[in-house]
Amino acid sequence: LNTTVLQGMAGQSLRVSCTYDALKHWGRRKAWCRQLGEEGPCQRVVSTHGVWLLAFLKKRNGSTVIADDTLAGTVTITLKNLQAGDAGLYQCQSLRGREAEVLQKVLVEVLEDPLDDQDAGDLWVPEESSSFEGAQVEHSTSRNQETSFPPTS
């Protein structure tokens, strides 16, 4: 599974959108979790409403908000007031009983504010050439990179 790299500015909000097959995942709740360590578990941060039909309602845990558009097949997670400690590897998951299927791996990087807006576009020029899309970010300079983890050494 590829990992999306998203960068957001400290103090601002970062919106993550994970898409999925709406039919395949019909009736399943979604969750956002943070991976602890290379081989560690994925610690649940927040999950959608317990009643699947109400999954469109926003659920919050601290500064993280999740909502699921089950018809469009898009679960949206918003990390508000980004802090350095929010940086990490996360997963969007689809829940079925005790099983969790990974929909998307997301690497969140939290950047220092640039000196001024003029510099913002030069924060990071990726060396790898890969498919770039518009960043899924609110009020934030960011890049969105699809890439795969290299093999562990």
């Epitope: 790299v5 290379e38 560690g40 802090q83 940086a87 690497l107």
Partner: antibody, heavy 121, light 107 residues
């Protein structure tokens, strides 16, 4: 064991640039941020910024923005910090340090031995 | 920027003493605080992260506590190898900042 080995001492003239290297071993290089910290003679520690070796993403303290460039070469598990437009007050020992969090910022756990950079005309 | 202050700036102690160093942040940093030990001419050594978690390989005579703005590093029984300068660092908010250091020397 986890180890960071830095390049040797440098003497530079004001206005020049210096590039310090930090070679990592004993762990998955792409899994852990590398921070750069400096210490001027007889003074305390000053954080400069970090690079995420997995993505190449960087951030730096505003004080250094526009003057510091952090890069990495994953094929040889090395990180680099280049400081340009050197001034005499950039004379310091420059350290690289690994963050202990997996692709996260949990505080540094292992430090390089330091690289002395002297800026003098 | 978050200012980190340490007290005392220096202290003299004897082998076997219990030593406490305090670190204060100018604003709340939760538990995003680390402690380091540095000896002259050497690189800093990481002792504590997340305010109270001991780094791997660090002896249990070192302990950390606190949350928010006030933190302490305690050395339960000072040994000859513990005479050094100790720094705290916050990694909650950019730029990550260090305290000015506390020098522990022999009485």
């Amino acid at each position: 064991q986890v180890q960071l080995v830095q390049s040797g001492a440098e003497v530079k003239k004001p206005g020049a640039s210096v590039k310090v290297s930090c070679k990592a071993s004993g762990y998955t290089f792409t899994g852990y941020y590398i921070h750069w910290v400096r210490q001027a003679p007889g003074l305390g520690l000053e954080w400069m910024g970090w690079i995420n070796p997995y993505s190449g993403g960087t951030t730096s303290a505003q004080k250094f923005q526009g003057r510091v460039t952090m890069t990495r070469d994953t094929s040889i598990s090395s990180a680099y910090m280049e400081l340009s437009r050197l001034r005499s007050d950039d004379t310091a020992v420059y350290y690289c340090a690994r963050d202990g969090g997996y692709l996260a910022l949990y505080g540094t756990d292992v430090w390089g031995q330091g690289t002395t950079v002297t800026v003098s005309s | 920027d978050i200012q980190m202050t340490q007290s005392p700036s220096s202290l003299s102690a004897s082998v076997g003493d219990r030593v406490t160093i305090t670190c204060r942040a100018s604003q709340g940093i939760s538990n995003y605080l680390a402690w380091f030990q540095q000896k002259p001419g050497k690189a800093p050594k990481s002792l504590i992260y997340a305010a109270s978690s001991l780094q791997s390989g660090v002896p249990s005579k070192f302990s950390g506590s606190g949350s928010g703005t006030d933190f302490t590093l305690t050395i339960s029984s000072l040994q000859p190898e513990d005479f050094a300068t100790y720094y705290c660092q916050q990694y909650s908010t950019y730029p990550f900042t260090f305290g000015p250091g506390t020098k522990v020397d022999i009485k």
